[in-house]
Amino acid sequence: CEEPPTFEAMELIGKPKPYYEIGERVDYKCKKGYFYIPPLATHTICDRNHTWLPVSDDACYRETCPYIRDPLNGQAVPANGTYEFGYQMHFICNEGYYLIGEEILYCELKGSVAIWSGKPPICEKVLCTPPPKIKNGKHTFSEVEVFEYLDAVTYSCDPAPGPDPFSLIGESTIYCGDNSVWSRAAPECKVVKCRFPVVENGKQISGFGKKFYYKATVMFECDKGFYLDGSDTIVCDSNSTWDPPVPKCLKVLPPSSTKPPALSHSVSTSSTTKSPASSASGPRPTYKPPVSNYPGYPKPEEGILDSLD
């Protein structure tokens, strides 16, 4: 027989020879990192037809690391579902908990023994320090020193000393999130007051008031024969400016040859902004101004706006 077979889990005892005589026996032992469990044979004999009798390394089992239970409030997940050396153990924490220690442990061979590469981690409850205090405002649970995962606080503004109130800029409620970080930045409290919006050749149709504070919303329409340049709806933003800017009402230019369509109310250049569905005089179909062919006249965007709802 030629050299005996080689195996992943067991090795020949002694040095291999170039050839073996019929009836000659060779013995194997489990390799480092494997252990023998009887009764399977770990030897073979050179048969009379010059082949080795069947033998396998099934009796040699891969060393395993000791069982690790799930950390409290988490899970230990063996990669490939095995504790054998060369494999990993992954640790994950339940929602609201975070890992302290190694996220992955490796089953390693130390000498002939399989051991984990470190201590199993623990899952600690996510806790947040109190959220930031804000100028001119306060939050709920201000006396609490430690917040747990998903605990929420709500901010509110103090009464203002002057005639104009403080407005809350940002989200009023934030919560203790992953990694012990609050879900977003704290809001701010400040006086926000926009100037009275004036649109010549047009009029305000909603959002009436003497003062315009944060998030005040105003809508406009143009007088007959004028079209809206800009948005018909504006909002007072946190910088005390209107967003988008206050629109203008521009005169509808006469057509080059055809008469302009009869306008019941206003004309808009914006194809994205919709006017309110109804007003005092009923529905208002809105069109683009007709295209002018006269030199020197500005040329509006081409195409006709769909009539609005």
């Epitope: 469990i37 395993t64 000791p66 069982y67 239970r69 799930d70 899970q75």
Partner: antibody, heavy 121, light 107 residues
Framework: EVQLVESGGGLVKPGGSLRLSCAAS????????MSWIRQAPGKGLEWVSY????????YYADSVKGRFTISRDNAKNSLYLQMNSLKAEDTAVYYC??????????????WGQGTLVTVSS | DIQLTQSPSSLSASVGDRVTITCRAS??????LSWYQQKPGKAPKLLIY???RLQNGVPSRFSGSGSDTDFTLTISSLQPEDFATYFC?????????FGQGTKLEIK
């Protein structure tokens, strides 16, 4: 004082079913892994099944795999063992046992008084 | 599965004697071995875990030693209440297995 009290044992015919319960008190049940361990009359101890504190990890002895189901209800501080397709060799006293809390290794620090299951025609 | 073999299967001793029970594992289990005491009609009681750590409330006359495959439970001076059956259990890998037991009787 830690207490584990098993119930649900009795006489059942081969192929029949039985559900064992274990009521736990005196400790935070939801923090502990639990096991069922059995002992045939006059014989040694045989571990049957094991469940993690949350119920996400479960192990069974080969002799009961596919026939027995371990479960727990942390809200009720209770452990269960549903036993189906019972055989004569399942006859034993069944103990509910708590796993000690060390992170590595499994030992059973508290045991119930046991409930006898007899499988016989 | 990891097999545990206890020896002797039974032994007779007198009060005050020093007694040793051994447990051999079919493969290395480091120190993941526990010892239990069981009296007739009662549930087992944990004595030793992690091969040598004494469980709370267990008298100090009980001690455990060993690692890898060979382990020993020693009772330094037998008391009348120590006559019982003793089991070893491996906690290295599932399935958790027990030794066949050692019955300690009064001589």
């Amino acid at each position: 004082e830690v207490q584990l009290v098993e119930s649900g044992g009795g006489l059942v015919k081969p192929g029949g079913s039985l559900r064992l319960s274990c009521a736990a008190s005196g400790f935070t049940f939801s923090d502990y892994y639990m096991s069922w361990i059995r002992q045939a009359p006059g014989k040694g101890l045989e571990w049957v099944s094991y469940i993690s504190s949350s119920g996400s990890s479960i192990y069974y002895a080969d002799s009961v795999k596919g026939r027995f189901t371990i479960s727990r209800d942390n809200a009720k501080n209770s452990l269960y063992l549903q036993m189906n397709s019972l055989k004569a060799e399942d006859t034993a006293v069944y103990y509910c046992a708590r796993d000690i809390t060390d992170v590595v290794g499994v030992s059973f620090d508290y045991w119930g008084q046991g409930t006898l299951v007899t499988v016989s025609s | 599965d990891i097999q545990l073999t206890q020896s002797p299967s039974s032994l007779s001793a007198s009060v005050g004697d020093r007694v040793t029970i051994t447990c051999r594992a079919s493969r290395s289990i480091s120190t993941y071995l526990s010892w239990y005491q069981q009296k007739p009609g009662k549930a087992p009681k944990l004595l030793i875990y992690d091969a040598s750590r004494l469980q709370n409330g267990v008298p100090s006359r009980f001690s455990g030693s060993g690692s890898d495959t060979d382990f020993t439970l020693t009772i330094s001076s037998l008391q009348p209440e120590d006559f019982a059956t003793y089991f070893c259990q491996q906690s290295y890998n599932p399935p958790w297995t027990f030794g066949q037991g050692t019955k300690l009787e009064i001589k």
